[in-house]
């Protein structure tokens, strides 16, 4: 028998140094967790004790905290290269720059191999990316080898900016051809890494013919054996085993998300190449495991262009932005506006000639919004700015819900009107109008919302039985300020890009803003 | 300034032993994997073998398994290659090349020692 | 014997486009890299291109590479006297499990 350990990360999403257990920026140092120079620590201490050892990341390093805004994936291949990962699969965030952004900081300048089996380049785009991402590679692992075969969510093109140049093909048809190739280099232990959420990994262990390893990402999916750590609710065992179509049983991992846990997986072969057995857990890098002093280092030298760009103008605004919470729980604030209309704005994707976008519309949570910004100060608009107005680190995510859904968040948003409470709804490409003086759970009067089906936007009533994609935070999305009804009916979620990132880059697009307040949402009293 | 430099080969009878020691300096060594590459008088360039930057990974060339091992010291920014039961056909300049890549040894060589000469002769 | 096969020698003179060729499979150029070296007599190897077609710093742009399929090539544009020398094409072999190093092109500039 082989034995392979296999250490892997997923989602890590910019998160280079240590956070706070919310995996929100690190406040008491004791008490944070993750971050880079601690993964270290923990993949050499594994290293130097067992002998076949890799360490992947199934994608998405990219996007979410100021480290990805201003240095642009550089740090990624800077740290990924100083850690010594030996593959990497690339996710739907890796194309948030565009290909540009993915082909100079990262596929040129990392030294491990990055892949996708599902992802096929045409046009000019073909000769300018060849070798530089590939559909799998066979790693040599003490004196064998083992076949890595990559794969990338094919919702990417509406997630992210990955342009007309690039395909992305079914996953488990995409994938089982790169199987067979490996198989006729008799290459007979095979991983499937991949960023397509933990339903299609498990697809993938069942469909795919000579995969025997899954690990994967996406879905933030925390899987543990025993009782769990930390405040995660593990989906279920790690590894998570799925018997194939042709009956071998296929362990699939993943790792939760911002380098908080460091994936643990001990794989036993035959000679053949099939699993004899499988077990681990993830590894929960908190402030007992010390961060590595060299990595800190560097860390620390990376991060003194973070201090300065944070302090920089992005933008201007000609009026007063009120994000106060007077305002934001009570009506529709101009600050609400802003925001919403941002992130709109970054989900713009022309993918089909039908629509003029495949999402028109946001809810953001009023408590979200924790601070006004002053035009006053010349206008002027700095990162430090907006980081007090969404303090929280989170991500404006893509979800699809049925209207039925949408309709009973906005009765969930007045439903105690009038204590100041963050449930209160601001919103993009809606117009609502409540009545107060009915009773809570039916103050809802009108609700209307802008099509995506059509060459003229316009805002049409919505319908209860229709599916809807929104832009909202992820707050929302996990049923926060109450919203249980979005987490438990929500039919898809990916998540999406720094809140703060989102903002500051459609000021520093538009130069100039001026949000008005402009009867998004109304109230009424009497009959309709 | 970036520098290889091989020492240990000579003249041996065929079935005999031999190690050759390659210096690194001007680089961090354990950052990159590392090759033995050789060429035999008048022929085209021949991989021996390999390591990546942790010993982890190691791979050789058909023509040399079983009979050749190569090893690192990372303390010591030193390759090696142990070279048992030579043959006639193992006659070459060997080289040692630095990889562009620390991991599985299938980068680019862009370092390179002026070599060491290794003669199997009866 | 080599798994990549290049033409033994080419030839242009000085100022022409001249292009070597080298044939692969898919367990090589099919699916890997391919690196470029250059060794001019009684000297070391060195590197001209790697990963397809990125060059190191201090290697003209006059050099380029390229592949396609199972199939590679170094063109060289406005060749110079001393470009002639012995070229390589060389990359990871998916099957012997081993890097392996094309047959060597001996280039003359006329």
């Known amino acids: 028998a082989w034995e392979l350990t296999i250490l892997h990360t997923n989602d890590v999403h910019s998160r280079l140094e240590q956070t706070s257990e919310d995996s929100s920026k690190c406040v008491n140092a004791s008490r944070c967790m993750g971050g880079v120079a601690r993964l270290f620590t923990k993949v050499q201490q594994i290293r130097r004790a067992e002998p076949n050892v890799l360490l992947l990341d199934a994608g998405d390093q990219y996007q979410g905290t100021i480290w990805f805004t201003v240095y642009k994936g550089a740090e990624v291949a800077h740290f990924m290269n100083a850690l010594r990962y030996d593959a990497m699969a690339l996710g739907n965030h890796e194309f948030d720059n565009g290909v540009e952004g993915l082909i100079e900081p990262l596929l040129k300048e990392a030294k491990f191999p990055i892949l996708s089996a599902n992802i096929k380049a045409k046009g000019p785009l073909a000769s300018q990316i060849s070798g530089l991402y590939l559909p799998y590679k066979v790693l040599p692992v003490g004196d064998e080898v083992v076949g890595i075969v990559g794969y990338t969510s094919k919702e990417t093109p509406f997630l992210s900016n990955p342009g007309t140049n690039l395909v992305f093909e079914d996953e488990i048809t995409a994938l089982q051809p790169e199987v067979d190739k490996l198989k006729t280099l008799n290459v007979n232990k095979i991983i499937a890494l991949g960023h397509s959420g933990f339903e299609m990994d498990k697809l993938i262990a069942q469909k795919v013919r000579g995969v025997d390893v899954v690990v994967g990402g996406h879905s933030n999916t925390f899987l543990y054996t025993g009782n769990p750590p930390s405040k995660e609710v593990p989906a279920g065992k790690y590894p998570f085993i799925v018997t194939s179509d042709d009956g071998r049983k296929v362990p699939v991992v993943q790792a939760y998300a911002f380098g908080k846990y460091l994936g643990y997986l001990k794989i036993e072969f035959d000679e053949r190449g099939n699993v004899i057995s499988s077990h681990g857990n993830p590894i929960l890098l908190n402030s007992s495991i010390p961060e590595d002093p060299s990595i800190k280092a560097d860390i620390n030298k990376w991060r003194i262009k973070l201090d300065n760009y944070s302090t920089q103008e992005l933008g201007k605004t000609i009026v007063y932005l009120d994000g106060s919470s007077q305002s934001c729980r009570f009506r529709e604030c101009n600050m609400g506006n802003l925001i919403c209309d941002a992130m709109i704005n970054n989900n713009l994707r022309h993918t089909d000639e039908m629509f003029w976008n495949h999402v028109s519309m946001c809810i953001l949570n009023g408590g979200g919004i924790r601070s006004p910004i002053d035009e006053r100060n010349n206008g002027t608009i700095t990162w430090e700015n907006l980081a007090a107005v969404l303090p929280f680190g989170g991500t404006f995510d893509l979800v699809q819900l049925k209207g039925s859904t949408l309709k009973k968040a906005f009765e969930h948003s007045v439903h105690r009107y009038g204590q100041s409470t963050g449930e209160f709804l601001q919103v993009g490409g809606i117009h609502v109008v409540y009545d107060l003086s009915r009773k809570p759970g039916d103050r809802v009067v009108k609700l209307d919302v802008l099509c995506t089906k059509c060459r003229v936007p316009s805002y049409d009533p919505l319908k209860m039985d229709e599916v809807y994609k929104v832009i909202l935070p992820n707050f929302l999305a996990n049923g926060g300020d109450g919203f249980q009804m979005i987490k438990d009916e929500l039919l898809r979620h990916d998540s999406g890009d720094q809140d703060i990132n989102v903002v500051s880059t459609y000021i520093s697009k538009m130069k100039v803003i001026y949000p008005a307040v402009e009867g998004r949402i109304k109230f009424s009293t009497g009959s309709h | 300034q970036l520098q290889l430099v091989e020492s240990g080969g000579g003249l041996v009878q065929p079935g005999r032993s031999l190690r050759l020691s390659c210096a690194a300096s001007?680089?961090?060594?354990?950052?990159?994997?590392m090759h033995w590459v050789r060429q035999a008088p008048g022929k085209g360039l021949e991989w021996v073998s390999g390591i990546s930057w942790n010993s982890g990974s190691i791979g050789y060339a058909d023509s040399v398994k079983g009979r050749f091992t190569i090893s690192r010291d990372n303390a010591k920014n030193s390759l090696y290659l142990q070279m048992n039961s030579l043959r006639a056909e193992d006659t070459a300049l060997y080289y040692c090349a630095k990889d562009i890549w620390y991991g599985g040894f299938f980068g680019a060589f862009d370092i390179w020692g002026q070599g060491t000469m290794v003669t199997v002769s009866s | 014997q080599s798994v990549l096969t290049q033409p033994p020698s080419a030839s242009g003179t000085p100022g022409q486009r001249v292009t070597i060729p080298c044939s692969g499979s898919?367990?090589?150029?099919?699916?890997?890299?391919v690196y470029w070296y250059q060794q001019f007599p009684g000297t070391a190897p060195k590197l001209l291109i790697y990963r397809n077609f990125q060059r190191p710093s201090g290697v003209p742009d006059r050099f380029s590479g390229s592949k396609s399929g199972t199939s590679a090539s170094l063109a060289i544009a406005g060749l110079r006297s001393e470009d002639e020398a012995d070229y390589y094409c060389a990359g990871w072999d998916d099957s012997v499990r081993g890097y392996v190093f094309g047959t060597g092109t001996k280039l003359t500039v006329l």
């Open positions: 001007g680089f961090t060594f354990d950052d990159y994997a």
């Open positions: 898919s367990s090589n150029i099919g699916t890997n890299s």
